[in-house]
């Protein structure tokens, strides 16, 4: 059961001093982060008992596992139902406290009633202030029963509930007709889901025999121990003033647990702390009584004395709940109250006993929950005890439950029950997740949802190349960390699987489903360098580069050219998709811009080192195109070009550039400068006979301008092959600019 306690301070002289505290002994309770589950909640539940609205109550968190409710201003604020919710996930548990007004017309003889399925529950409301009207009983706020005021027996109104079932659980109240609901007697009925001494689905399992008023939980068979007792069967008393499943909590204040009501998870309900009784838990137990609500009787024998907190304190030579067992009677020693094993393991369980006559191997036996008796395989005999070792057959889930070690000698017998939890090793429900990949490593998130039981102690990652029959490689990692698989092959698919383990022998679970993870290509390592670049216009740039010569195939798919315009903060990327290319024409650039240029080799998605950068200044945009370009053949090797100057010039033309290209030819065009910008005609010489040529031209001021229209003309026939075209303008020869 969840270790959750709701304490109510019942010193009711001043409601402003009243407080409710919810304490959780669960690991990480109340922290409220995802890792630890939701925080503790403590609130008044107004669904059934509605009280007049008052100022809001104050909630204070004290540390990670305690929450307190204060701010009650008048006694009516206290009346009703309060609940504390704690624990995470399937263990989320609600603890309920029902508060009655001490001045009510009717008062409950006992607030919490825990009964077994099929029992008869009897709720008893004691008359505190008589009224001569009917008494109305309600269940969870709805009408349930009417009693005539004459039906009081011994000053009490009784509600008998025969053959109760779990749905009968809830808040019951008894109220005189016309009286305020705050004058009602409020009760809490808890109906266990099973008959007495049974638990589990179908109620087939036997409860461990909870001692000292502990109540067997109908779902898990654990004893919910009264405040002040601990152990699998509540067999051990805490020191005075302590409570919690491991006696780890201490009652506040100098008077210990006096005046406090303790509410624990169902099916326990609420009671005073050990050693106290009364409606306000302020009365010490009468002699001979002990425990929560002083419900237990000591009945000590053989000179034992009754302690109201722990029961019988035995003189030396005697032991047992009533000091009824002589130390000569055999006694099981130091048996753990709870053991945990993994499914399908074959553990060894030890059971030690002492006594006179001395227990021998055959006198100690182990009984499983299904009644099977195991005999010890060996015994270690020491002067003060005999320890029997039992080899347990392969464990199955049905072995979970209460086992018993029993010792029998002619001096008597003793037995000790202990709980065995058979845990299922965890099995991943999903494949691990790939976080990042490189050519020789994969970064993997291994921890996934799993079936079976935690906690996860280790995570193993198994991996090998896809379709390989070689052995799996294994890496053991911390459950909370990501894993880097290293020294892998580039561009290779790997099958990766997770295996989870929980603590203890046989805690390794089956491997989870595989997933395919592929390493990246190898990184290109060669660094290109820029051979040169050539401005082909105000917006065009031809770039060439080289790579170092290395043996073996080139690792690369192409080149990435990057142009950085620092002024505008813009980057231009040009992809050259052939690894053999060593030149590229970059077009659509911004005239008059200063660019930083570099080139790098790429392979798959990986980039190699960038070349040292070059700085390139593109000329500003030039003048408009020359107008009305016309070509006229003069001979078998000469063609005359005529044109008109461009309009709306931004400045004086420095030269014209003529482009000459054989029509349909595959070679690069030739550029010829006309350095006399005032001219409007020029003769291109050295052409081939009977050859069709294409011409276009542009002007230059600071930068080259737009091209004119293209014109076609053929040289005349019968000439010899010329050496190449040249230009003559007014008989002046000009060189070629390629």
């Amino acid at each position: 059961a969840v270790d959750l306690t709701l304490l109510a301070n019942l010193r009711l002289t001043d409601p402003q001093r009243f407080f409710l505290t919810c304490v959780s002994g669960e690991a990480g309770a109340g922290r409220g982060s995802d890792a630890w589950g939701p925080p503790l909640l403590l609130e008044k539940d107004d669904r059934i008992v509605r009280t007049p609205p008052g100022p809001p109550l104050r909630l204070a968190r004290n540390g990670s596992h305690q929450v307190t409710l204060r701010g009650f201003s008048k006694p009516s604020d206290l009346v009703g139902v309060f609940s504390c919710v704690g624990g995470a996930g399937a263990r989320r548990t609600r603890v309920i406290y029902v508060h009655n007004s001490p001045g009510a017309h009717l008062l409950p003889d006992k607030v919490t009633h825990t009964v077994n399925k099929g029992d008869t529950a009897v709720l008893s409301a004691r008359v505190h202030k008589e009224k001569q009207t009917d008494v109305i009983w309600k269940s969870n706020g709805s009408y349930f029963y009417t009693l005539d005021w004459h039906e009081a027996q011994d000053g009490r109104f009784l509600l008998q509930l025969p053959n109760v079932q779990p749905p009968s659980s809830g808040i019951y109240s008894a109220t005189y007709l016309e009286a305020s609901p705050l004058g009602s007697a409020f009760f809490r009925l808890i109906v266990r889901g099973c008959g007495a001494g049974r638990w589990g689905p179908g109620c087939t399992k036997e409860c461990p025999g909870c001692l000292h008023g502990g109540v067997c939980h109908d779902h898990d068979g654990e004893c919910v121990c009264p405040p002040g007792f601990t152990g699998t069967r509540c067999e051990q008393a805490c020191r005075e003033g302590r409570f919690g499943q491991s006696c780890q909590e201490q009652c506040p204040g100098i008077s210990g647990c006096r005046g406090l009501t303790f509410c624990l998870p169902d099916p326990y309900g609420c009671s005073c702390g050990s050693g106290w009784r009364g409606s306000q838990c302020q009365e010490a137990c009468a002699p001979g009584h002990f425990g929560a609500d002083c419900r237990l009787q000591c009945q000590c024998q053989n000179g034992g004395t009754c302690d109201r907190f722990s029961g019988c304190v035995c003189p030396s030579g005697w032991h047992g709940v009533h000091c009824e067992k002589s130390d000569r009677i055999p006694q099981i020693l130091n048996m753990a109250s709870e053991l945990e094993f993994n499914l399908e393991t074959m553990p060894r369980i030890n059971c030690a006993a002492a006594g006179n006559p001395f227990p021998v191997r055959g006198s100690i036996e182990l009984r499983k929950p299904d009644g099977t008796v195991l005999l010890s395989t060996k015994a270690i005999v020491e002067p003060e005890k005999t320890t029997a070792e039992f080899e347990v057959p392969r464990l199955v889930l049905a072995d979970s439950g209460f086992w018993e070690c029993r010792v029998s000698t002619s001096g008597g017998q003793d037995s000790r029950r202990f709980k065995v939890n058979v845990k299922v090793p965890p099995v991943p429900l999903a494949a691990p997740r790939l976080l990042t990949k490189q050519s020789r490593q994969l970064v993997v998130s291994p921890l996934v949802s799993f079936s079976g039981d935690g906690p996860i102690s280790t995570v193993r990652l198994h991996y090998r190349p896809q379709d390989s029959t070689m052995d799996w490689s294994t890496i053991v990692v911390d459950p909370s960390e990501n894993v880097t698989l290293m020294n892998l092959r580039p561009k290779t698919g790997y099958s990766v699987r997770v295996q989870l383990s929980r603590p203890g022998e046989g805690g390794e679970g089956a491997w989870g489903p595989p997933t395919l993870m592929t390493t990246d290509c190898p990184e290109p390592l060669l660094q290109p360098w820029l051979e040169g670049w050539h401005v082909e216009g105000t917006d065009r740039l031809r770039v060439s580069w080289s790579l170092p010569l290395v043996p073996g195939p080139l690792v690369g798919d192409g080149f990435l050219l990057r142009l950085w315009d620092g002024t505008r903060g813009q980057e231009r990327r040009e992809n050259v998709s052939s690894p053999q290319a060593r030149t590229a024409l970059l077009t659509g650039l911004t005239p008059g811009t200063h660019y930083q240029l570099d080139v790098q080799l790429y392979h798959c998605t990986l980039l190699g080192p960038a070349s040292p950068p070059a700085h390139v200044l593109l000329p500003p945009s030039g003048p408009p195109a020359p107008r009305h370009l016309h070509a006229q053949a003069l001979s078998d090797s000469e063609i005359q070009l005529t044109w008109k100057h461009p309009e709306a010039l931004p400045g004086p033309i420095s030269k014209y550039v003529v482009e000459v290209q054989v029509a349909g030819g595959a070679g690069d065009p030739l550029w010829i400068d006309v350095d006399r910008p005032e001219e409007t005609s020029t003769i291109i010489r050295g052409l081939n006979a009977s050859t069709r040529y294409l011409f276009r031209m542009r002007a230059s001021i600071q930068g080259l301008g737009d091209w004119s229209n293209t014109v076609e003309e053929s040289t005349l026939g019968n000439g010899l092959q010329a050496e190449g075209p040249v230009q003559e303008s007014r008989a002046a020869e000009e060189g070629l600019d390629q």
């Epitope: 001569q132 009207t133 029963y145 009417t146 039906e151 016309e178």
Partner: antibody, heavy 117, light 110 residues
Framework: EVQLLESGGGLVQPGGSLRLSCAAS????????MGWVRQAPGKGLEWVSS????????YYADSVKGRFTISRDNSKNTLYLQMNSLRAEDTAMYYC??????????WGQGTLVTVSS | QSALTQPASVSGSPGQSITISCTGT?????????VSWYQQHPGKAPQLMIY???KRPSGLSNRFSGSKSDNTASLTISGLQAEDEADYYC??????????FGGGTKLTVL
Amino acid sequence: EVQLLESGGGLVQPGGSLRLSCAASGFTFSRYKMGWVRQAPGKGLEWVSSIYPSGGPTYYADSVKGRFTISRDNSKNTLYLQMNSLRAEDTAMYYCARSEVGAPDYWGQGTLVTVSS
Amino acid sequence: QSALTQPASVSGSPGQSITISCTGTSSDVGSYNLVSWYQQHPGKAPQLMIYEGSKRPSGLSNRFSGSKSDNTASLTISGLQAEDEADYYCCSYAGSSTLVFGGGTKLTVL
């Protein structure tokens, strides 16, 4: 839906007897206080008798005390009124009523009892 | 067990408010806050309108309200409607687990 169906009324001579029944449905009969209320023709309502859920305490109006007996059978969800030594002034519509709030909250449609020679 | 005293008749126009009184003694109305009111249309069974002096059964119109002062209880109907025309009876707990009814009031909606 709560339903109460009275039966057993009719014409009876003075000094005679009648047994009225009330069949209940739509609620847990065994938990409720039940009663009979009558209404003489053209007159007001008059409480006759009440019985508590367990069949325990029973109460009667002075006008019927010693002559009428109220009873119930929780296993049959039925309320009864045994009327003996009937008088002309007992002529009325007899209503069966359920009480949840200290007074009748649901009523049947009634059964007419006529005492006449 | 004397009957509680109610006016034989009251009347009002649609939309108006009317009040019906019910006078008892210190042994019944005066001692307990357990007055209930019933509406009865001709030929029909009575229907509970108010209980414990001023509480309304769920689903009943809030035009009906009840109150008590000393030995007199009152039923007020606001926003009178034609379907409110009926006989109205008060009833009080009278101690010793007995009940006493009023003589009834005929409400006429003009």
